[in-house]
Amino acid sequence: AGVFELQIHSFGPGPGPGAPRSPCSARLPCRLFFRVCLKPGLSEEAAESPCALGAALSARGPVYTEQPGAPAPDLPLPDGLLQVPFRDAWPGTFSFIIETWREELGDQIGGPAWSLLARVAGRRRLAAGGPWARDIQRAGAWELRFSYRARCEPPAVGTACTRLCRPRSAPSRCGPGLRPCAPLEDECEAPLVCRAGCSPEHGFCEQPGECRCLEGWTGPLCTVPVSTSSCLSPRGPSSATTGCLVPGPGPCDGNPCANGGSCSETPRSFECTCPRGFYGLRCEVSGVTCADGPCFNGGLCVGGADPDSAYICHCPPGFQGSNCEKRVDRCSLQPCRNGGLCLDLGHALRCRCRAGFAGPRCEHDLDDCAGRACANGGTCVEGGGAHRCSCALGFGGRDCRERADPCAARPCAHGGRCYAHFSGLVCACAPGYMGARCEFPVHPDGASALPAAPPGLRPGDPQRYL
């Protein structure tokens, strides 16, 4: 268990042209408040999916009236932190939505009117117990500066708030099987704490805060025996004579789901199924529409004309997420062909092509031999983006312009002497060797180990390599 804390530092016009008009005026004074919604993990969740990690609403800020003619300054903020308690482990990765709301205080019929000024969203990694993390997010012409952290509530500690600590009972060391609680070396790890009220006889837990029942027992706290007798209703009658015990209060008792949501029990708690146009853990959040500007980074809002219809953000290339809030590493898709280097410039992708290739994605293989002549009877061979000449005998170099020394590579084996010849090279073999490159030993009895010497050539005679 622990608390996610959000501190809003400022909300005002962002840098650059097109400063927003002040949301308040002398005729229509207003004040701001903020809402934060947290979801676990970095998965792409729909904007209307529940704030499964929790949500919180700030207090109202001071009443603000625009000074005529003045640009919108940083607006006065509510005091204090937004705190979102979490009951289970801190997930380490989370998604957030922070909404800035305006409460208009003019002579509204039926009380104050609320409107959404800005919404920012993002996905972050955060270890519990770490320092405050600072962030700046822009929504249109507005800029929100804030800090956040996750801290564990005693006795929980650790980056996920899953380790439990308690003060040492003995000054020197912890009890059997329990380690010191780094960094709180004066405390010891405690055994798991199950859900409050979990039956010590019939319940157990493998994770902090859960309550799992032994066979024969049921209910959120494992206090209800599983009966074989027939009960009048799934929850059991109030009379004990039928053999069914009245269960303890269930998580859906009193229906925690607002706005007509229906409640269903889950192994750990409850779940609200919300009507269209509402979302949140308890269906407490009314639907977001395209008019609220939920699509970031140039996303186009499709559908969602009214709270009863969900919107979809069509994201520009390079962004994804239900609100186009997540940048995609477009180079990870390896769009550049033929070994081109990928550059994601944000507004566009660029491919830096290897020699011999061209096109936006290096898809065109240039004709390497076009306009390239190989001298002295050489032929041009394309390959790998660079032309190569296959040279006629006796020539070498990139364009076959250099006279080749055929003996430079010392081609004659076993001490044979090399002689350059108009048609190639000639090896004069040392005694006991034969072959074009003097590669074959001559057997002592005069028979060669491999092909016989051509007629008219004795072993040891120079062999011309054609």
Epitope: P17, G18, A139, A291, L300, P317, H347
Partner: antibody
């Protein structure tokens, strides 16, 4: 430099299907959304719809029942089909690339006039 | 759908003068997702401004855009002869994408 070129018949009979193609050069067709916009003679611009290589499409609701936009990455082309045309569909039809930072139109074809007449 | 109304319908000015073209939306345009285009007779529109105030590549700095919410402005600081054309605004925050009806900028 990105270039777009519309092609297709300039005259279509009422109740028939208007079919246009747009050939893209100088850019990867997989990297952007591609759109059709039309402009009746002497009037303003009207967005018809767009497509992305992933298959995502979006059409103007008043035309949705009659419009299909498709894309052929191998030919570097995307196409517009508009069914059951009437004289009100007479317009210059433009194909355009949707920009990298939002759904504005940063490159346009030169346009092709399609007249619906018997 | 978001209806964009441009004013004036026609603006008559001389080269060297300053032109101010207005585009008003029937409801707030998300995150200032508004673009401006220039169109000359017989030609395709030319992309000028996106995000209400960001100039497209190659657009001279005499063109500037401003505004947010429902009121947007395109300003041409010193008119050149080639600037006389029809100008359209377009919002791309909410589907359907919509254009204004255009403002004709003509030589006085």
């Amino acid at each position: 430099q990105v270039q777009l070129q519309e092609s297709g018949p300039g005259l279509v009979k009422p109740s028939e299907t208007l079919s246009l193609s747009c050939t893209v050069s100088g850019d990867s067709i997989r990297s952007y959304y591609w759109s059709w916009i039309r402009q009746p003679p002497g009037k303003g611009l009207e967005w018809i719809g767009y497509i992305y290589y992933s298959g995502t499409t979006n059409y103007k609701s008043s035309l949705k029942s009659r419009v299909t936009i498709s894309l052929d990455t191998s030919k570097k082309q995307f196409s517009l089909n508009l069914d059951s045309v009437t004289a009100a569909d007479t317009a210059v039809y433009y194909c355009a690339r949707i920009g990298p930072a939002g759904f504005y139109f940063d490159y346009w074809g030169q346009g092709t006039l399609v007249t619906v007449s018997s | 759908e978001i209806v964009l109304t441009q004013s004036p319908g026609t603006l008559s000015l001389s080269p060297g003068e300053r032109a101010t073209l207005s585009c008003r939306a029937s409801q707030s345009v998300s995150r200032s997702y508004l673009a401006w285009y220039q169109q000359k007779p017989g030609q395709a529109p030319r992309f000028l401004i996106y995000g209400a105030s960001s100039r497209a590549t190659g657009i001279p700095d005499r063109f500037s855009g401003s505004g947010s919410g429902t009121d947007f402005t395109l300003t041409i600081s010193r008119l050149e002869p080639e600037d006389f054309a029809v100008y359209y605004c377009q919002q791309y925050g909410t589907s359907p994408i919509t254009f204004g009806q255009g403002t004709r900028l003509e030589i006085k």
